[in-house]
């Protein structure tokens, strides 16, 4: 059975990520997916109201990074 996402972290740990290990937050479909399902990101067209790329959110990605910026498909950290 899958384990639920966890958000408790040490003070110096990376920012929480919703995904279980081996899964990444997909910025196109807006939920966690198996990291292997992520495709090569494409640049986001200027003015797009929805994210164009299919890319992953890293656990340590800084908040505010654009949805069109490439992110390595790293698994979530528990």
């Amino acid at each position: 059975m899958r384990r639920g996402p966890r958000s408790l972290r040490g003070r110096d740990a990376p920012a929480p990520t919703p995904c279980v290990p081996a899964e990444c937050f997909d910025l196109l479909v807006r939920h966690c997916v198996a990291c292997g399902l992520l495709r090569t990101p494409r640049p986001k067209p200027a003015g797009a109201s929805s994210p164009a790329p299919r890319t992953a959110l890293q656990p340590q990605e800084s908040v505010g990074a654009g949805a069109g910026e490439a992110a390595l498909p790293l698994p979530g950290l528990l």
Epitope: P16, T17, F25, V29, H31, C32, L57, V63
Partner: antibody, heavy 118, light 107 residues
């Protein structure tokens, strides 16, 4: 403890604009992957997803209502606001806000009943 | 949009009975499915997420399974407090959609 609470008018007149506020605690909308959205439920009927906003300010709307909806967030106030224009009696429903964090909607507010009548 | 067809729309069972609700998606949703319980006058509560994972604090008599387009929610032994309407919810793709609900009553 995650909590969400909806506030806004209980009665609006046809053609008016509805503004609902979701005030939440126990999480931050600046956290990567976090989202808050709105769902409604007409009396005795099923749930209908309306709109959602994420930590990175991306917004999504139900296509059937997109022209009438606007969702915004105020991260510092822990609030998400939904506006719905041109209200009609068929929009009478309980409106819920709910959180998402990677796996669909997990925590919901108590809901607020909005009646549209002249 | 992905259509979610939930059945039955209502059922009546005795305390202790095994209750099964099904949800069929109009296309493959790859296990991105949740189940909620809604009691009269209350907000929905998440019971099962991601097809089979039990949400925090939910009794183990609730379970979920399925894949592709077909999903099942089970109450292994119905309790009086389980009287409610149950909904499935797909978050595979936007717009997110819900099943029509199943009202569970006690015989």
């Amino acid at each position: 403890q995650v909590t969400l609470k909806e506030s806004g008018p209980t009665l609006v007149k046809p053609t008016q604009t509805l503004t609902l506020t979701c005030t939440f605690s126990g999480f931050s909308l600046s956290t990567s992957g976090m989202g808050v959205g709105w769902i409604r439920q007409p009396p005795g009927k099923a749930l209908e997803w309306l709109a959602h906003i994420w930590w990175d300010d991306d917004k999504y709307y139900n296509p059937s209502l997109k022209s009438r909806l606007t969702i915004t967030k105020d991260t510092s106030k822990n609030q998400v606001v939904l506006t719905m224009t041109n209200m009609d009696p068929v929009d009478t429903a309980t409106y819920y806000c709910a959180r998402s964090f990677g796996y669909g909607l997990d925590y919901w507010g108590q809901g607020t009943l909005v009646t549209v009548s002249s | 949009d992905i259509q979610m067809t939930q059945s039955p729309s209502s059922l009546s069972a005795s305390v202790g009975d095994r209750v099964t609700i099904t949800c069929q998606a109009s296309q493959d949703i790859s296990n991105y499915l949740n189940w909620y319980q809604q009691k009269p006058g209350k907000a929905p509560k998440l019971l099962i997420y991601y097809t089979s994972s039990l949400h925090t604090g939910v009794p183990s008599r609730f379970s979920g399974s399925g894949s592709g387009t077909d999903y099942t929610f089970t109450i292994s032994s119905l309790q009086p407090e389980d009287i409610a309407t149950y909904y499935c919810h797909q978050f595979s793709e936007l717009p997110w959609t819900f099943g029509g609900g199943t009202k569970v009553e006690i015989k």
